[in-house]
């Protein structure tokens, strides 16, 4: 089955700059298929823009200004790129790549879409750190004791732009866990969002991760916020007078300032 | 030019109660095109649901049914047993791929129909209320209540800021909510909830424990590195060396 990955969740540009959006195709040989690009402007229908066929033929939608969009495909890297020249306010949109997934007969094809890249145009230079700043909340004792379950909460603040994806995984598992989230909220010039995960008691002793995708994450990779295992067996210890940290007691901090 | 027009902009549906979305074609006969349906969920993911000739996307065949009403020139998508996972924007789109004639392999989309999912009508359920804290941040977690109307109040004399609560459907088909705030006196913040003409307090759920039952480390600022000053905990939670975590990356 074909799979389309658009590594950039968003791309923030200042007016008149050039944006290049990438789409990586797997599960299908890009040399044997056409790649399509669509855009969804706020409040408008999703519109076909341009396609590039397996032989490199480019087809543009009528009414699209020439020289605005450039599309190409690189068979060696199985990628297609959409270049948007001289970006202006009317280019603000989410851009999707798509392809027809080959099935036995022509009429039985289906078109699959990539996750989209939102083009954001700003007139201000963002030199400050606008990556999502995380705060973790661990389950309250009351919840774990009374409900035999625990809720982890991942708060992300002071990020720009507003486009963000949050999901949860257990350590060493590729399964995305069912979580819940609030709306993205504007706070001054930046945004905040939170997501929470409730797990049964038997999963509390596993490490969980809140995985955050955002354009301005440090080094441009997903941020993985670790929620440590919660042990329900608690031992008493004789506090040491000095501030030594031994290997089993690393920075005694496990952020359990979660009261009832 | 052809146009695909959804019947409604927004369709509220109840969990488990079948719902029907309709999309009419203007300017052409629907029989000359293949109809497709897609769902866009939070985070912009566009997932293929159905294409004419009984083609369904993975995981959609059991719960969705696509159809064409040639006489009325419209496409129909039935959600047989909606669940909270079915919330999103639904789009109809058409093409003539493989039909002969003037061949178009691009999709022409209609505007989306926003499907909002509500729990089905059920007996009223009182919420459980728990407070979670980190530094000046306080979260009030309100679990498993019905109906939806609720007022969540974080009780503090030193409020810095508060955010609107998030209210969502729980996996069990009731509601969950979270309200966040920042307070100078976060240690003393409690949460009280007005629901169904009753008040529920987080303190109602507190577990009476002795002082060795939980670690209470020195408060750490929400996005700062752990405090360098030492404190002497009365107890230690077995954390399997997890405190190397980049708790605020």
């Amino acid at each position: 089955a074909g799979h389309l990955e658009q590594p950039q969740i968003s791309s923030t540009k200042t007016l008149s700059k050039t944006a290049r959006l990438e789409c990586v195709v797997s599960g299908i040989t890009i040399s044997a298929t056409s790649v399509y690009w669509y855009r969804e402007r706020p409040g408008e229908v999703i519109q076909f823009l341009v396609s590039i066929s397996y032989d490199g033929t480019v087809r543009k939608e009528s009414g699209i200004p020439s020289g605005k969009f450039e599309v190409d495909r690189i068979p060696e890297t199985s990628t297609s790129t959409l270049t948007i020249h001289n970006v202006e306010k009317q280019d603000i949109a989410t851009y999707y790549c798509a392809l027809w997934e080959a099935q036995q007969e022509l009429g039985k094809k289906i078109k699959v879409f990539g996750p989209g890249t939102k083009l954001i145009i700003t007139d201000k230079q963002l030199d400050a750190d606008v990556s999502p700043k995380p705060t973790i909340f661990l389950p309250s004792i009351a919840e774990t004791k009374l409900q035999k379950a625990g809720t982890y909460l991942c708060l992300l603040e002071k990020f720009f732009p507003d486009v963000i994806k949050i999901h949860w995984q257990e350590k060493k598992s590729n399964t995305i866990l069912g979580s819940q989230e609030g709306n993205t909220m504007k706070t001054n010039d930046t945004y905040m969002k939170f997501s929470w995960l409730t797990v049964p008691e038997k999963s509390l002793d596993k490490e969980h991760r809140c995985i955050v995708r955002h354009e301005n994450n440090k080094n441009g990779v997903d941020q993985e916020i670790i929620f440590p295992p919660i042990k329900t067996d608690v031992i008493t210890m004789d506090p040491k007078d000095n501030c030594s940290k031994d290997a089993n007691d690393t920075l005694l901090l496990q952020l359990t300032n979660t009261s009832a | 030019a052809i146009e695909l027009v959804p019947e409604h902009q927004t369709v509220p549906v109840s969990i488990g109660v079948p719902a029907t979305l309709r999309c009419s074609m203007k300017g052409e006969a629907i029989g000359n095109y293949y109809i497709n349906w897609y769902r866009k969920t939070q985070g912009n993911t566009m997932t293929f649901i159905y294409r004419e000739k009984d083609i369904y996307g993975p995981g959609f065949k059991d719960n969705f049914q696509g159809d064409i009403d040639i006489a009325k020139n419209l496409a129909v998508l039935k959600i047989l047993a909606p669940s909270e996972r079915d919330e999103g924007s639904y789009y109809c789109a058409c093409d003539t791929l493989g039909m002969g004639g003037e061949y178009t392999d691009k999709l022409i989309f209609g505007k989306g129909t926003r499907v909002t999912v509500e729990p089905r009508s059920q007996p009223h359920t009182k919420p459980s209320v728990f407070v979670m804290k980190n530094g000046t941040n306080v979260a009030c977690l309100v679990k498993e209540f019905y109906p939806k109307d609720i007022r969540i109040n974080l009780v503090s004399s030193k409020k810095i800021t508060e955010f609107d609560p998030a209210i969502v459907i729980s996996p069990s088909g009731k509601y969950n909510a979270v309200k966040l705030g920042k307070y100078e006196d976060s240690n003393s913040v409690t949460c009280s909830v007005q629901h169904d003409n009753k008040t529920v307090h987080s303190t109602d759920f507190e577990v009476k424990t002795d002082s060795t039952d939980h670690v209470k480390p020195k408060e750490t600022e929400n996005t700062k590195q752990p405090s360098k000053s030492c404190h002497k905990p009365k107890a230690i939670v077995h954390t399997e060396k997890v405190n190397m975590m980049s708790l605020t990356v």
Epitope: P7, I9, K17, T18, R20, E76, Q169, G220 | -
Partner: antibody, heavy 118, light 107 residues
């Protein structure tokens, strides 16, 4: 933001093949691209290829197609690169690196020295 | 393929000095550029991406600038740990290519 541990140095004969490994930890392997790069002693860097940890999709520098073969083992979160028909020109340090949202290299393994000698 | 021409090939400087390394692309790469530092016997480390965004943990004495085909990396008030090799890399198109490098030595 995670570790990338590469296998040890290799001394191989011309014409032979070598399989290098890059064991990752501390980040979600299945949603990342692992790239391989070559650096001859005293020279600059060359990008060879990347592979997606989840889909197994591969992107090559055309110069290295047929020379490098990339695979992943998702259960051990390890990426592999097999280099075949080795010549002395292939003597180099080979790095694995984690790709950013744009195609820059955000985090690197420590490198594996491959020496091709008769 | 896009060629990246780095200059100078080598550079001698003293601690406390300010130095600038430049990189020219054979075509417009629209700020799709990264800089790396590599010390003897070590792996390269990301310094700057998107032409001017400082990577995590990189001191503020480093700064990237430029546009079109011309880019530069400036290091203010050189520190002893800054000596080593520096490479630029474009990611405008494939294949991804690097400059030949600049060797920054202690005078």
């Amino acid at each position: 933001q995670g570790q990338m541990q590469q296998s040890g140095a290799e001394l191989v004969k011309p014409g032979a093949s070598v399989k290098l490994s890059c064991k990752t930890s501390g980040f979600t392997f299945s949603s990342n691209y692992i790239s391989w790069l070559k650096q001859k002693p005293g020279q600059s860097l060359e990008w060879i290829a990347w592979i997606h940890g989840g889909t197994g999709g591969i992107g090559y520098n055309q110069k290295f197609t047929g020379k490098a073969q990339l695979t992943v083992d998702t259960s051990s979160t390890t990426a592999y690169m097999q280099f075949s028909s080795l010549t002395t020109e292939d003597s180099a340090i080979y790095y694995c690196a984690r790709r950013g949202y744009g195609a820059w290299f955000a985090y690197w393994g420590q490198g594996t020295l491959v020496t091709v000698s008769a | 393929d896009i060629q990246m021409t780095q200059s100078p090939a080598s550079l001698s400087a003293s601690v406390g000095e300010t130095v600038t390394i430049t990189c020219r692309a054979s075509e417009n790469i629209h700020n799709y550029l990264a800089w790396y530092q590599q010390k003897q016997g070590k792996s390269p480390q990301l310094l700057v991406y998107n032409a001017k965004t400082l990577a995590d943990g990189v001191p503020s004495r480093f700064s990237g600038s430029g546009s079109g085909t011309q880019y530069s990396l400036k290091i203010n008030s050189l520190q002893p740990e800054d000596f080593g090799n520096y490479y630029c890399q474009h990611f405008w198109s494939y294949p991804l290519t690097f400059g030949a490098g600049t060797k920054l030595e202690l005078k």
